[in-house]
């Protein structure tokens, strides 16, 4: 990740906003604060992004590599099968779920795991780079 | 699947301290989320919720009966134990372990998916 | 305490026929994030009791149809549309919006 502003200004990779960063074409950002899925949601759409998708492993290698143990809710929610928020189904990675009322999806540096959508947790943003 | 077994003495003399275990498996109490409560029914009677206890260890108990109850897991072993000092034979029950889910407040839960079969404990002289 | 209460505490009803359960909770209990967290468990005869209803109206995964919850504030209800024999047992409600959780008293439902 090109972490542009987060820990050092980095002239090759100014195309992210303040405190986004850079992976490939897209930009990421990672919150601070917590709040319900629905609202972390809606704080990525204000910012012409959405709540992560993940396309593939390698990416979900890379984010998981910068995240600690606490998890951060990703665009993922269990509606007759856990589907990304674009309609796609989750199929390159396991979610951790045994309980049916727990339908959203959190992500941290070891798993995918199933929450309870109204838990705050911090988030992550993608959207595709200037 | 989810499967969630107490075990306990059966029989328990007035001012005796009850050990109750609830095993379980299907799910880990490492889990974020995951919690697991006891609940008690008195013969004929209505279901009272007695305390639970977190993935991240957080508990929380009835405040009537806070001062005799102890909850503490074992998650290598899958297990959760509940202890209650100074028994009487209003504490004459069925006592439930049952599995628990995270909304966000420790201290109360929701979507008891999961029970035991219940162990009975008689408290006589 | 949230006091929960239900009515009736014992429901005959025919089988086929339509029954209603009440409960009634002494304090609001919608919690601070805007849920209700009011269920409804079933317990037969002889069972541990298991969950029919969560959050109001969700039906628990495997309960038929013909159960719905409904409500808000302080005032519930469970239907049956269409009772049989094998919903016969004692159903509480259950709120876990406030500290301390609290169980309705149970309504036995049975069959005439």
């Known amino acids: 990740l090109c972490q542009g502003s987060k820990y050092s200004t980095c002239a090759s990779c100014p195309s992210c906003p303040d405190h986004w960063m850079k992976y490939g074409n897209h930009c990421y950002y990672f919150s601070v604060e917590k709040k319900d899925w629905i609202s972390s949601l809606e704080f990525c759409l204000a910012r012409d992004s959405h709540l992560l998708m993940i396309t593939d492993k390698q990416e979900m290698s890379l984010l998981q590599d910068f995240l600690s143990e606490a998890f951060h809710w990703v665009g993922l929610r269990n509606n007759s099968g856990w589907r990304w928020e674009d309609g796609s189904p989750l199929n390159f990675s396991r979610i951790y779920s045994n309980s049916l009322v727990q339908t959203c999806g959190a992500i941290n540096k070891n798993s995918l795991q199933a929450s309870s959508c109204e838990v705050s947790l911090q988030w992550v943003c993608k959207k595709v780079s200037p | 699947q989810v499967i969630l077994k107490e075990s306990g003495p059966g029989l328990v003399k007035p001012t005796q301290t009850l050990t109750l275990t609830c095993t379980f498996s299907g799910f880990s109490l490492t889990t974020f989320g995951m919690g697991i409560g006891w609940i008690r029914q008195p013969p004929g009677k209505a279901l009272e919720w007695l305390a639970h206890?977190?993935?991240?260890?957080?508990?929380s108990y009835n405040s009537a009966l806070k001062s005799r109850l102890t909850i503490s897991k074992d998650t290598s072993k899958n297990q959760v134990v509940l202890t209650m000092t100074n028994m009487d034979p209003v504490d004459t029950a069925t006592y439930y372990c049952a599995r628990t889910i995270y909304y966000g407040n420790y201290l109360t839960f929701y979507a008891m998916e999961h029970w035991g079969q219940g162990t009975t404990v008689t408290v006589s002289s | 305490d949230i006091l929960m209460t239900q009515s009736p505490l014992s429901l005959p009803v025919t089988p086929g026929e339509p029954a209603s359960i009440s409960c009634r909770s002494s304090?609001?209990?919608?919690?601070?994030?805007?849920?209700?967290?009011l269920e409804w468990y079933l317990q037969k005869p002889g069972q541990s009791p298991r969950l029919l209803i969560y959050k109001v109206s969700n039906r628990f995964s495997g309960v038929p149809d013909r159960f719905s919850g409904s409500g808000s504030g302080t005032d519930f209800t469970l239907k049956i549309s269409r009772v049989e024999a094998e919903d016969v047992g004692v159903y509480y409600c259950?709120?876990?919006?406030?500290?301390?959780?609290?169980f309705g008293a149970g309504t036995k439902l049975e069959l005439k």
């Open positions: 259950f709120q876990g919006s406030h500290v301390p959780p609290t």
């Open positions: 206890i977190w993935w991240n260890d957080d508990k």
């Open positions: 304090q609001n209990i919608v919690h601070s994030n805007g849920n209700t967290y």
